[in-house]
């Protein structure tokens, strides 16, 4: 996606500082940087802080140990002031200075835009000693320059607690346009206008933008970066990209797909996770969303019973999670279930229908005509009842559950008995004398335990009392009958 149309028409020569012994004569401009005429002392006082010396490029003259001769001020020699080069090229520049041999331990550091360059940079300092002075050349090289190498570079030399600073070398890296904003993929409504943005920078500036739709240029004249393309509307998917051009060549952005929003595809793989007598838990796999987020889904339920009126129950639910518990169903019934989902454009078709069944339910009515009487000779309580009239959906009767509660003088004790479906009577042992026994009976199917009958109470006297009169629940089971003995 990146091509370079051409390199600079001419190379940009580097002008290193003079080698030892040579003179610099070009004082025409900043590009080879002249001093002021006459050296200025290094210890200038700061305008706003009178006590703070300004340590500049020039170290002030020093008297030799013999005290006989002044040393010249120290300053970096002038070098090229501005280097322009293309990205990925190599560059080398340097600072040079001649230091009298009486100075020891000179160190040169490189700085870029106020920060010291440490570590992985290629800085080499070479020393050329002579009788009285040592010429020092500090070279800095960058291989395959990047835009981030743009900046103002300076040398600093520490010498006798003085800091001598060179004039700057401006490094300007040019290259192919670099995108700061590329078009983004979008999902749009059919025939509705939308905007795409593309922005790229140099250097070199300017950067011009061409838009491309499905491999064809949209604009004949380039637009200055940043560029906003207004597309009046699409009827089908399209791919857009932008070309950024500058004097170095062109860079092409990523291609982005613009999709047209449509109704979703129907959900698939509707499956049953759990069935109870009155509910079914289903899940589904959403279909393709039509490039527009799902808003909600609709679960449609039809009873399969040929005698039913064929009406459809509709349950609306959120699009996520892709699961729904259908409630308020009849027990032991067959249903056909489908799912449809919608986005901003509309509803999908319904998924393939699946069959599901509810399980049998618990009985809905209690046993009838419950009667209780005391058989004192056997020291037990006889219980009798009539089988309840259960619906088919409640399933097959598997038995009965008897609850008997014994209460006397602040003590209460409940016991449960299970009996088979063929029985309509039971006997329970007397648990406590001089107490009240309260009996309730519920029918049981595979679907669960039905409601208990109304309670029937019988008083169990102390030993020696005889009374065979029953307590009973009159059909259809009314108030709280109790036998008073």
């Amino acid at each position: 996606a990146i091509t370079e149309a051409r390199e600079e028409a001419k190379p940009y020569p580097l002008f290193p500082g003079p080698l030892p012994g040579s003179l610099q004569t070009d004082h025409t401009s900043l590009l080879s940087l002249p001093h002021t005429s006459g050296y200025q002392p290094a210890l200038m006082f700061s305008p706003t802080q009178p006590g703070r010396p300004y340590t500049g490029n020039v170290a002030i003259p020093r008297v030799t140990s013999a005290g006989s001769k002044l040393l010249p001020p120290l300053a970096f020699k002038h070098t090229v002031g501005h280097i322009i080069l293309s990205e990925h090229k190599d560059v080398k520049f340097n600072c040079s200075i001649s230091v009298p041999n009486i100075y020891q331990d000179t160190t040169i550091s490189w700085w870029k835009d106020g920060k010291e360059l440490l570590g992985a940079h290629h800085a080499i300092t070479q020393f050329y000693p002579d009788d009285e002075v040592t010429a020092i050349i500090a070279s800095f090289s960058i291989t395959s320059v990047q835009r981030s190498d743009n900046g103002s570079y300076i040398c600093k030399m520490k010498i006798n607690n003085e800091e001598i600073v060179s004039d700057p070398i401006y490094i300007e890296v040019q290259g192919l346009p670099h995108f700061t904003k590329q078009p983004e993929s979008m999902n749009v409504t059919r025939n509705t206008a939308f905007n795409l943005t593309c922005q790229a920078v140099g250097p070199p500036e300017p950067v011009n933008i061409f838009w491309v739709q499905n491999s064809s240029r949209v604009n004949e004249q380039p637009e200055k970066s940043p560029s906003v393309l207004t597309v009046p509307g699409l009827t089908e998917m399209a791919v857009f990209s932008c070309e950024a051009h500058n004097d170095k060549g062109l860079t092409v952005s990523k291609g982005v797909q613009i999709n047209i929003k449509a109704i979703p595809s129907p959900p698939t793989e509707v499956s049953i996770h759990n069935s109870t007598a009155h509910s079914i838990l289903i899940s589904w796999v959403p279909g393709f969303d039509g490039y527009s987020p799902f808003r909600n889904c609709s679960v449609q339920v039809k009873e399969v019973d040929p005698l039913s009126n064929g009406s459809v129950m509709i349950f609306n639910t959120s699009a996520s999670p892709h699961m729904y518990q259908i409630k308020q169903l009849q027990a032991l019934a067959n249903y056909s279930i489908g799912v449809s989902c919608m986005n901003e454009i509309g509803w999908s078709a319904v998924s393939p229908w699946i069959l599901a069944s509810t399980t049998e339910g618990a009985p809905s009515v209690a046993p009838l005509n419950v009667t209780v009487f005391l058989n004192e000779s056997r020291d037990n309580v006889d219980i009798r009842w009539m089988k309840p009239l259960t619906k088919r959906q409640a399933g097959e009767l598997v038995g009965y559950r008897i609850s008997h509660v014994w209460q006397s003088a602040g003590i209460s004790k409940e016991l449960l008995e299970e009996v088979g479906q063929n029985n309509s009577r039971a006997q329970i042992s007397v648990q406590v004398h001089n107490a009240t026994c309260t009996v309730r009976i519920a029918a049981v199917t595979k679907g669960g335990v039905g409601p208990f009958s109304d309670p029937v109470k019988i008083f169990i006297p102390a030993h020696g009392w005889v009374d065979h009169a029953p307590s009973s629940t009159p059909a259809p089971g009314n108030a709280d009958p109790v036998l008073i003995i």
Epitope: H27, G56, H82, K112, S166
Partner: antibody, heavy 118, light 112 residues
């Protein structure tokens, strides 16, 4: 972002001196040259000189040598220009500007008006 | 010194017209490193100069593509393809190849 903020207008008497300031922000002050430019009312622009704040080196237009003195204070990122022995010819708007990487005066201060009048 | 001669001094235009400003130097502005340091500025009334074109033909960041620069050696031109009201002001050229830096005398772009 790069900004150069200059001091306010000055009304001074002939023969006096004035010192105007240019506070830089948004970049490394010690790494880029600051230039000063003069503009007399209704006239063109005249380059006065430059200072490199990193080491204090200066260069002057010969027409302004002895008239303008350029200094910089790195602790406050401020460049200064002192104009001395003022005459009516020195009444002008003075601009500071940064010499950017592209080797052009890319950002300018808003200008300081100096009026010399008795 | 490099003397910069700018013409015309005044340029009356109608909005939407093309405008062309010339700047001629008394010596070549090509520096020893191969670059030509000739820049163009616009100074709107009551404002500081603002950089438009640097090194002959490069538009500065944010400058509209109606502005273009060309030339080499000693002769340079700034063109505005379709003048708009916001373009009105004084245009200056500036050379920074030689010290002292020197400006053109300015061209005032005004409505006809």
């Amino acid at each position: 972002q790069v900004q150069l903020q200059q001091s306010g207008p000055e009304l001074v008497k002939p023969g006096a001196s004035v010192k105007i300031s240019c506070k830089a922000s948004g970049y490394s002050f010690t790494s880029y040259y600051i230039h000063w430019v003069k503009q007399r009312p209704g006239q063109g622009l005249e380059w006065i000189g430059w200072i490199f704040p990193g080491n204090g080196n200066t260069k002057y237009n010969e027409n302004f040598r002895g008239k303008a003195t350029l200094t910089a204070d790195t602790s406050s990122s401020t460049a200064y220009m002192q104009l001395s022995s003022l005459t009516s010819e020195d009444s002008a708007v003075y601009y500071c500007a940064r010499l950017g990487l592209i080797y052009a005066l890319d950002y300018w201060g808003q200008g300081t008006s100096v009026t010399v009048s008795s | 010194d490099a003397v910069m001669t700018q013409t015309p001094l005044s340029l009356p235009v109608s909005l939407g017209d093309q405008a062309s400003i010339s700047c001629r130097s008394s010596q070549s502005l090509e520096s020893s490193n191969g670059n030509t340091y000739l820049h163009w500025y616009l100074q709107k009334p009551g404002q500081s100069p603002q950089l438009l074109i640097y090194r002959v033909s490069n538009r500065f960041s944010g400058v509209l593509d109606r502005f273009s620069g060309s030339g080499s050696g000693t002769d340079f031109t700034l063109q505005i393809s379709r003048v708009e009201a916001e373009d009105l002001g004084v245009y200056f050229c500036l050379q920074v190849t030689h010290v002292p830096f020197t400006f053109g005398s300015g061209t005032k772009l005004e409505i006809k």
